[in-house]
Amino acid sequence: ATKLTEEKYELKEGQTLDVKCDYTLEKFASSQKAWQIIRDGEMPKTLACTERPSKNSHPVQVGRIILEDYHDHGLLRVRMVNLQVEDSGLYQCVIYQPPKEPHMLFDRIRLVVTKGFSGTPGSNENSTQNVYKIPPTTTKALCPLYTSPRTVTQAPPKSTADVSTPDSEINLTNVTDIIRVPVFN
């Protein structure tokens, strides 16, 4: 069995976590991807998902979480903006490949958010409206569910994370839930 590893990131309230999860390009480019939180003894909880199928460089925003899937580079970019202390926890990127269980992209991210002023670019959440004007939709599921089997093999890629920099700046206020319309059986 593969040993699960973690990378620890310590950030201040108001900062942005910026995670890049690598995946095998030819296998998973269009697969739906998600950002999950893992808590001891519990089923992982999906917090946000890409479209189904995943669209190239198309930002999906759910609350303070923004997902972007860069097919050309084989990476899923996850940003959690305006971090709060309660965001602290263990996270992972996964690829949905129903009916198989989600495939985890290594490493897991151990996020520790502490109180304290941050002057990090992108940490001021009071200035502008949403960067991404995605029309809100009403949907049954947080993540659209596949209705037919898809078989894929997998390799364990790696994830990296860093604090936001000016070129990844995003300012959000009055964040609303932006989710997609699913297909159901």
Partner: antibody
Framework: QLQLQESGPGLVKPSETLSLTCTVS??????????WGWIRQPPGKGLEWIGS???????YYNPSLKSRVTISVDTSKNQFSLKLSSVTAADTAVYYC?????????????WGRGTLVTVSS | DIVMTQSPDSLAVSLGERATINCKSS????????????LAWYQQKPGQPPKLLIY???TRESGVPDRFSGSGSGTDFTLTISSLQAEDVAVYYC?????????FGGGTKVEIK
């Protein structure tokens, strides 16, 4: 239209094992991303989640029942099953199977009609 | 485990009048990161299984009449039936799915006055 139907003995003796099966019709248990769960309701009382299973066999159990519960799945028969060991009168309840949106959501959007299981000698 | 407490235990309302059911969780069921409250409401009529009415605290399940609405955030939630109909006589349950195990409230019985 997807339907769930519970089946199994309506009477179980104390200290024995309660065994129930849920048959899924109108769709394949293994062709979507749902978990499948068991919930029970003692007569005149509230609802208690017992546990849930994915078609691959991954399970999550209620810690209060974990030592006595086994949930399994048989994809060839489109069924999943519940076994509850060492039962007592407190396990008398209507047992429901339900579709569980699992790690995607966590609520139960489709339920079987339920089957009453009485624990008595 | 998260404890879900419903009030009142029972409620008698005249036809066409508003019915309000409260649900309180022992800890927040809101993930602030995605702004989602992991709370659902169910309706259970005698001899029937529960039926999903509301999820994400305020989103109506497909086919549920719009007289049913859910509101609230964090630890305090409300199910409102804006104009009670005879077919709404049932027991209503809230359920949190924020953490394992998912837990249900004790139920509120709604009757016609």
């Amino acid at each position: 239209q997807l339907q769930l139907q519970e089946s199994g003995p309506g009477l179980v003796k104390p200290s024995e094992t309660l065994s129930l099966t849920c048959t899924v019709s109108g769709g394949s248990i293994s062709s979507s991303s749902y978990y499948w769960g068991w919930i029970r309701q003692p007569p005149g009382k509230g609802l208690e989640w017992i546990g849930s299973i994915y078609y691959s066999g991954s399970t999550y159990y209620n810690p209060s029942l974990k030592s006595r519960v086994t949930i399994s799945v048989d994809t060839s028969k489109n069924q999943f099953s519940l076994k509850l060991s060492s039962v007592t009168a407190a396990d008398t309840a209507v047992y429901y199977c339900a579709r569980d949106l699992g790690q995607y959501e966590g609520y139960f959007d489709l339920w079987g009609r339920g089957t009453l299981v009485t624990v008595s000698s | 485990d998260i404890v879900m407490t419903q009030s009142p235990d029972s409620l008698a309302v005249s036809l066409g009048e508003r019915a309000t059911i409260n649900c309180k969780s022992s800890q927040s069921v809101l993930f602030s990161s995605n702004n989602k409250n992991y709370l659902a409401w169910y309706q259970q009529k005698p001899g029937q299984p529960p039926k999903l009415l509301i999820y994400w605290a305020s989103t109506r399940e497909s086919g549920v009449p719009d007289r049913f609405s859910g509101s609230g955030s964090g630890t305090d939630f409300t199910l409102t039936i804006s104009s009670l109909q005879a077919e709404d006589v049932a027991v209503y349950y809230c359920q949190q799915y924020f953490s394992t195990p998912p837990t249900f409230g004790g139920g509120t019985k709604v009757e016609i006055k």
